[in-house]
């Protein structure tokens, strides 16, 4: 079971449902972006491979005071089996490349849509 209860979903949901909702939240962010997302904050780029949910969370958790991505941060924590805190980094980070949060979200969204289309939900 994918347990995302307590912050966004009403309880445990299938992995495909959780991924669908994460995609929609990222679509929401990209559609509703007026001013620069999170004041143009920069985050570490990540390798979009296995373990990318934790890596994405590790990268985004370092952005504070940005309400636009708070729901995304909470949703990503449902996909990551371990607790993530600010300043934590995994080998999945491309540690020499920082990109704007807006670009990070777009890249992540494109990749998640591809996974969803291909039926890779876990």
């Amino acid at each position: 079971l994918t347990c995302l209860g307590g912050f966004a979903s009403p309880g445990p949901v299938p992995p495909s449902t959780a991924l669908r909702e994460l995609i929609e939240e990222l679509v929401n962010i990209t559609q509703n972006q007026k001013a620069p997302l999170c004041n143009g904050s920069m985050v570490w780029s990540i390798n979009l491979t296995a373990g990318m949910y934790c890596a994405a969370l590790e990268s985004l958790i370092n952005v504070s005071g940005c309400s636009a991505i708070e729901k995304t941060q909470r949703m990503l924590s449902g996909f990551c089996p371990h607790k993530v805190s600010a300043g934590q980094f995994s080998s999945l980070h491309v540690r020499d490349t920082k990109i704007e949060v807006a670009q990070f979200v777009k890249d992540l969204l494109l990749h998640l849509k591809k996974l969803f289309r291909e039926g890779q939900f876990n």
Partner: antibody
Framework: EVQLQESGPGLAKPSQTLSLTCSVT????????WNWIRKFPGNKLEYMGY???????YYNPSLKSQISITRDTSKNQLYLQLKSATTEDTATYYC????????????WGTGTTVTVSS | DIQMNQSPSSLSASLGDTITITCHAS??????LSWYQQKPGSLPKLLIY???DLHTGVPSRFSGSGSGTGFTLTISSLQPEDIATYYC?????????FGGGTKLEIK
């Protein structure tokens, strides 16, 4: 009360594009997920795809090159287009709602029957 | 895609009987299974979701059970209004898939 009502051509010729409409009343299509499902003669049900509250779409990979789901939020309607219809597309077409964070269809339309024949 | 095999394809029973319909998934779907009822000439209606949770307004004579790959829908004390075709559906992964249906008739 949420109601879904499908409409379509009834009869179509092979190679034509089928265009179907689902009119939603009592609820805004800018919430939740709006799906198309069809039932073939013999009762087999096939999931076709959805358009989300954001306008994002998903299509069953078996239909991907043939199908398009769009919407008009001002009319509270969703649309299904099926390109290059064949006799195999003869079916009753349903639209159905799926709420956020769920994976089951809680409200269905009455369905519209489409026969593809030369 | 996950295949859903439903049996029997048709069933004849007497009023007051208890009947069981089974659905088998080609892979583990946990409890992400729902059941629908479609009466002749009408639209499908959700009966049960999450394998055993009754949808709002559904009579308690309907019940569901199972997890993993095997599921059952049970109708106890069969009523005339239960004449319908019943379908299962998996929600584990996209594309969602349905069982072939079970047509229930009264003897």
């Amino acid at each position: 009360e949420v109601q879904l009502q499908e409409s379509g051509p009834g009869l179509a010729k092979p190679s034509q594009t089928l265009s179907l409409t689902c009119s939603v009343t009592g609820y805004s299509i800018t919430s939740d997920y709006w799906n198309w499902i069809r039932k073939f003669p013999g009762n087999k049900l096939e999931y076709m795809g959805y358009i989300s509250y954001n306008g994002n779409t998903y299509y069953n990979p078996s239909l991907k090159s043939q199908i398009s789901i769009t919407r008009d939020t001002s009319k509270n309607q969703l649309y299904l287009q099926l390109k290059s219809a064949t006799t195999e597309d003869t079916a009753t077409y349903y639209c159905a709602r799926l709420a956020k964070w769920t994976w089951y269809f809680d409200i269905w339309g009455t369905g519209t029957t489409v026969t593809v024949s030369s | 895609d996950i295949q859903m095999n439903q049996s029997p394809s048709s069933l004849s029973a007497s009023l007051g009987d208890t009947i069981t319909i089974t659905c088998h998934a080609s892979q583990n779907i946990n409890v992400w299974l729902s059941w629908y009822q479609q009466k002749p000439g009408s639209l499908p209606k959700l009966l049960i979701y999450k394998a055993s949770d009754l949808h709002t307004g559904v009579p308690s004579r309907f019940s569901g059970s199972g997890s993993g790959t095997g599921f059952t829908l049970t109708i106890s004390s069969l009523q005339p209004e239960d004449i319908a075709t019943y379908y299962c559906q998996q929600g584990q992964s996209y594309p969602y898939t349905f069982g072939g249906g079970t047509k229930l008739e009264i003897k």
